[in-house]
Interface confidence: low
C-alpha cells in the first residue's frame, strides 16, 4: 500500500521521496530491500539518503530495485517502499509509456504544462522544453518557473513534452529529464443518447444450422469527441467473454466518423458452426455512453429451406 513507483534514466539524477509521511524532524532510514543493506547518508556516495529523500547522483541501471524507508518518531515507526527502475537511454526519439508521467490537458485559455517531480530537485531556471524531441521555439512557448505556457493552444499542440533541467548538489551538476503527454480539450461536438442503427429492436435473424453467422451491433453517439462510447454484445445478459462459448466471439468493427460528423461504432458477433442451442439464446446489442444504455435484442431462427413450401 505504501509503495511508490519511481523511474529515471541512467546517467541522470534521480531523487525519490519516501512514500510514508512524517514531520521534517523525524529520522528516516533507507535500506536496499534485497540485501537489507543500509543506504549511507554521506554525500560523497553516488547513492545516498538525505532525510525523506533518496538520491541517485547519477543513476545507474544496476540501481533498479526496491528500497525501504523507515520513518522513525519517538512513538512509532512507519515503513514505505520505493520501487525504483532505471532505464537505459533511448537511442531514438520515442519516449516509451513506462517513462511517461501523468497526462495533463489544456485549452485555448489555459495551457500550463508542469515539469513533473521538479520540486524534489535543486534547480535553477530556465527549464528547457522539447515536444516530441524537438526543442520548442517561437513566441507561443514560454518557460515560466516550473511550467511551460503555450499561447493560443491548437489541437496540433497535443503530444509528448519533455522538460530538461540541471540539478545541483554541492557544486556538481546533473541532468534530469521528465516527459508527460499534453492533451487538448476539444470544445466541438455533442453527445446524445446512443442510437442503435442495427440490429432493429426484437429482430429475428435467420441462420442455417452448421453454418457461420455474423451479427453487427452498430450505434452512433453524437458529433465529435465522445465520452465512453461503447458497443458490445451480451448473451442471455452475460458478457461474451464470461459466457464461455468459444464458438461465439465478438470483435470490434470500424470506428466510423461519417461525413455528417456523427461518431459511430460497430461490434461484430461471430458465431461459428451455428447449433440448435444457439437458437434458444437472447442476443443483446448494447450501446452506452454518459446518457445511458440502449439495448436491442435479437433472436435467431432456423432458416427455412427454399423448397419448403407445402
Amino acid at each position: 500500500k505504501f509503495s511508490k513507483q519511481s523511474w529515471g534514466l541512467e546517467n541522470e539524477a534521480l531523487i525519490v521521496r519516501c512514500p510514508r509521511q512524517g514531520k521534517p524532524s523525524y529520522t528516516v532510514d533507507w535500506y536496499y530491500s534485497q540485501t537489507n543493506k543500509s543506504i549511507p547518508t554521506q554525500e560523497r556516495n553516488r547513492v545516498f539518503a538525505s532525510g525523506q529523500l533518496l538520491k541517485f547522483l547519477p543513476a545507474a541501471v544496476a540501481d533498479s530495485g526496491i528500497y525501504t524507508c523507515i520513518v522513525r518518531s519517538p512513538t512509532f515507526n512507519r515503513t514505505g517502499y520505493a520501487n525504483v527502475t532505471i532505464y537505459k537511454k533511448q537511442s531514438d526519439c520515442n519516449v516509451p509509456d513506462y517513462l511517461m508521467y501523468s497526462t495533463v490537458s489544456g485549452s485555448e485559455k489555459n495551457s500550463k504544462i508542469y515539469c513533473p517531480t521538479i520540486d524534489l530537485y535543486n534547480w535553477t531556471a530556465p527549464l528547457e522544453w522539447f515536444k516530441n524531441c524537438q526543442a520548442l521555439q517561437g513566441s507561443r512557448y514560454r518557460a515560466h518557473k516550473s511550467f511551460l505556457v503555450i499561447d493560443n493552444v491548437m489541437t496540433e499542440d497535443a503530444g509528448d513534452y519533455t522538460c530538461k533541467f540541471i540539478h545541483n548538489e554541492n557544486g556538481a551538476n546533473y541532468s534530469v529529464t521528465a516527459t508527460r503527454s499534453f492533451t487538448v480539450k476539444d470544445e466541438q461536438g455533442f453527445s446524445l443518447f446512443p442510437v442503435i442503427g442495427a440490429p432493429a429492436q426484437n429482430e429475428i435473424k435467420e441462420v442455417e444450422i452448421g453454418k457461420n453467422a455474423n451479427l453487427t451491433c452498430s450505434a452512433c453517439f453524437g458529433k465529435g469527441t465522445q465520452f465512453l462510447a461503447a458497443v458490445l454484445w451480451q448473451l442471455n445478459g452475460t458478457k461474451i467473454t464470461d459466457f464461455g462459448e468459444p464458438r461465439i466471439q465478438q470483435e470490434e468493427g470500424q470506428n466510423q466518423s461519417f461525413s455528417n460528423g456523427l461518431a459511430c461504432l460497430d461490434m461484430v458477433l461471430r458465431i461459428a458452426d451455428v447449433k440448435e442451442e444457439d437458437l434458444l439464446l437472447q442476443y443483446d446489442c448494447l450501446a452506452l455512453n454518459l446518457h445511458g444504455l440502449r439495448r436491442h435484442t435479437v433472436r435467431l431462427s432456423r432458416k427455412n429451406p427454399i423448397d419448403h413450401h407445402s
Epitope: 497526462t103 490537458s105 489541437t155 470544445e187 465529435g224 465512453l228 446518457h291
Partner: antibody, heavy 132, light 107 residues
Framework: QVQLVQSGAEVKKPGASVKVSCKAS????????VSWVRQAPGQGLEWMGG????????TYAQKFQGRVTMTRDTSTSTVYMELSSLRSEDTAVYYC?????????????????????????WGKGTTVTVSS | DIQMTQSPSSLSASVGDRVTITCRAS??????LNWYQQKPGKAPKLLIY???SLQSGVPSRFSGSGSGTDFTLTISSLQPEDFATYYC?????????FGQGTKLEIK
Amino acid sequence: QVQLVQSGAEVKKPGASVKVSCKASGGTFSNYGVSWVRQAPGQGLEWMGGINPSRGTTTYAQKFQGRVTMTRDTSTSTVYMELSSLRSEDTAVYYCAKGDIVVVPAAMFSLGPGYYYYMDVWGKGTTVTVSS
Amino acid sequence: DIQMTQSPSSLSASVGDRVTITCRASQSISSYLNWYQQKPGKAPKLLIYAASSLQSGVPSRFSGSGSGTDFTLTISSLQPEDFATYYCQQANSFPITFGQGTKLEIK
C-alpha cells in the same frame, strides 16, 4: 470561462415540487453535458442525472426516475432541474455541473475510444429545504 | 450500480505531510476515475481526471494513480489550504457514483 449561476434557496412543503435553474454566464454550454448532483446536510455527493443542453436528451439515476425532470432553454443558456413529490430527505444543496470532454491517449482506456468525461465547472449550489 | 469506497473516512495530518487517500470500486472501472476537493459551504472542485491526469490550474503536489478497482490520491506536501473533504467519482458506467468522502483535518 463558463460560470454556472444557480437560482436562490427554496423552502418547500412535503409533496410539493421545486424547480432549480442553472444559467451559463460568460459562454454557453451547448456542447457539454450538464449534471445535477445533490448533497444532503453532512452527507456526500449524489449524482441525480444529466442533460445534453444542445439536444435536450436526459439521463436520470434510477433513484430519481419518475420524480426528476431536467429541461433546458437554449435561448437563455439555462438548464432546469425539477424534483416533485418532495419529502424531508430531499433537503439538500443541489449543484449543477458542466461536463467537459477531452481527448486523451486511447492507450489509457480499455473500453471504447479515448474520450473522457468529468465535471469541471460547478455552480455554487441551491439550498432546498423541505419542511412542514 | 458501481459502489465506490474511500478510506480512510477521516484523516488528521500536519502541514508538510505526505497524504494518501484510497478509493476502491466494486468492479473494474479501467481508468475512469476522477477526484474532487470540497471545502465547507463550497462546491466541489475537480483535481484529477482519468485516474492520474492533473486538471489545469491544480497544484502539482496533487497526484493520482491506479486503474481497475484500486486508486489513490496523493498530496505530496500538505498546505494549509488542502484541509478539506475529498471525493472519488467513477465515470465508467451509468449512473455516475461517488465515494463517501475522506475528511482531511489538521492534526
